[in-house]
Each structure stands twice: as C-alpha cells, then as structure tokens.
C-alpha cells in the first residue's frame, strides 16, 4: 500500500532512507537538458520474494535536443540484464553488510539522472532526518518518521526534530547535534 503523502517536511532538515520496502517506486527523473527515453519506464519498482528483493525496470535518459540520431547513454535492452546484475553486484562489495529482508538497497546511478531522487514510499517505510548544513538539531525524541496505516488511511509519524540556526539560543540546553553513528544510522536509531 503506497503512502498517500510524502514524509513530513521539517524546516532546515532533509530525510533519507537506509533501504526501501518492496512496493516502493522511484521516479525516472533526468537532469535539465535530458529526458526519459520514449520506450523507457517512468519508474523503477522494488519487487521481490521472501529471500531476495531487487529493482525492476531501468531508468534511461537521453538528450532533449537529440532527434533521430539519439545516442543511448545507458545499455541497450539486450544488454540490460547482464549490466544490471553487474551493477547490483558492485553495490554489494562492502563486507559485513546484511540486506534487510523485504527491502531493496539504493539503486545504482544512471547517466544524466536528476540530482534529487523522488521516491513513492509504502506502508512500513522508515525515513531518517538530519538538519542541513549550518543548523543544529534539537531533539525531543527520534528523528525519524514511519508510514503507518490507521483506520484505512496512511499517515507519517511526526519526527521529533527541530533545526535551529547555530547562532540561535537552544530550546533544550546541553543538546548537541548528533553525528551519524559508525553504521551510518542516525543516533536515535542505534541508541534506543
């Protein structure tokens, strides 16, 4: 079940996911001056079974100016399966990292993709928040949000995070901005 809304917006903060639940969709967005190829899928989809999850479809961008002489900047269809396998294998090369069951990892980049990715999340997805550069975090609780189903409707829990300018007085004296912990998760996730 897709979440009806985007995760909550927190002023001066961004959110990220560690992994993506099956059913998540990623828009195939291209940078300025490029567009999705006509035969290309508009999105990638996280699919899988009990033992393995992966992204279906591939995003491909081509120059907006190109006409009949369009040069594909990603593999031709017959090459895609082999290339995709290689790309996915290349993502797994860090040792001691176990994939979450029922989740896809971050899809590899594609040529000329837009800088910011647009995901459509499903119920059960968790995203994590941090303040942007130049702002510090004031916490009342975990800086995360979970998409939940309540009475047949989806909603995101409210992350307990306020981001304040570094020169502004703290509302919660003694609180420091948490640095990400060694495994890459925000402190609120690892210290509960």
């Amino acid at each position: 079940e897709l979440c009806d809304d985007d995760p909550p917006k927190i002023t001066h903060a961004t959110f990220k996911a560690v992994a993506y639940k099956e059913g998540t969709m990623l828009n195939c967005e291209c940078k300025r001056g490029f567009r999705r190829i006509k035969s290309g899928s508009p999105y990638m989809l996280c699919t899988g079974n009990s033992s393995h999850s992966s992204w279906d479809n591939q995003c491909q961008c081509t120059s907006s100016a190109a006409r009949n002489t369009t040069k594909q900047v990603t593999p031709q269809p017959e090459e895609q399966k082999e290339r995709k396998t290689t790309e996915m294998q290349s993502q797994m090369q860090l040792a001691d990292q176990v994939s979450l069951p029922g989740h896809c990892r971050e899809p590899p980049p594609w040529e000329n993709e837009a800088t910011e990715r647009i995901y459509h999340f499903v119920v059960g997805q968790t995203v994590y928040y941090q303040c942007v550069q130049g702002y510090r975090a004031l916490h009342r609780g975990p800086a995360e949000s979970v998409c939940k189903m309540t009475h047949g409707k989806t909603r995101w829990t409210q992350p307990q995070l306020i981001c304040t300018g570094e020169t502004e007085p703290s509302q919660f004296p003694g609180e420091e901005e948490p640095q990400a912990s060694p495994d890459g998760l925000p402190e609120s996730e690892t210290s509960r």
Epitope: T14, S90, T115, E116, A180, G184
Partner: nanobody, 125 residues
C-alpha cells in the same frame, strides 16, 4: 567550513596497490554520499567511485570495477579508496567530493558541492 583533504597518493609500479584517504570536516560526514573522481593529464575529470551516506552501497566506473574499493568510516569522518592492480592508465590526480544535501550518489560533478585539492597517483609501467 567544509574541508576535504586527500592523502595516500604516490608513485607506484603497475600491479601495485595504493590506499587513498580523504579526511572530512565542517559537515555531518555520516549524512552524505561521497565520491572519488580523477583527472589524467590533458583530460577531463572523470568519475571513479561513489558510496551512499550509510556506506552500505557502492558504485564504480567500469574501468575500475573489481580493482578499486570505496568505503567510508562515519565514526572517523574519513573516505577511502583502496586501489589494487594499478595500471598506467590509472595515473592522474584523485579528488574526493561531497555529495549535495539531497543527492543520493556523488556520481556526476553536478551531484557534488565540495571538492578536495587532490592527490597525485602515478603508475609506471
């Protein structure tokens, strides 16, 4: 302010290994994707490898896949590039780069907002 300082470059023989490091400061290193790029003499800067904010996922240029390994230590604010089976065409200045706030990967130069000064790697045959 944001600072990225590469180290570990040098002159090696073909087939040797090198490990580059990039010490980061002035930003929340654990929250950002990072990348390595290189520039050979007379050529444009090109993508080498990138890693997501968590350090879980990596991606490589075809020319280095299977020989180079990117990693990041979020506890020590340091990015690494382990380079094995070096070849003469790996010669160049290697730069580490910080991904923009909302970028998932440091894959293209557009994805990055801060760069180190670079470290020279020379591979002789």
């Amino acid at each position: 302010q944001v600072q990225l300082q590469e180290s570990g470059g040098g002159l090696v023989q073909a087939g040797d290994s090198l490990r580059l490091s990039c010490a980061a400061s002035g930003f929340n290193f654990g929250w950002h994707a990072m990348g390595w790029f290189r520039q050979a003499p007379g050529k444009e800067r090109e993508f080498v490898a990138t890693i997501t904010w968590t350090g879980r996922d990596t991606y490589y240029a075809d020319s280095v896949r299977g020989r180079f390994t990117i990693s990041k230590d979020n506890a020590k604010d340091t990015l690494f590039l382990q380079m094995n089976s070096l070849r003469p065409d790996d010669t160049g200045v290697y730069y580490c780069a910080k991904a923009r706030e909302r970028a998932t990967w440091a894959y293209s130069e557009d994805d990055c907002d801060y760069w180190g000064q670079g470290t020279q790697v020379t591979v002789s045959s």
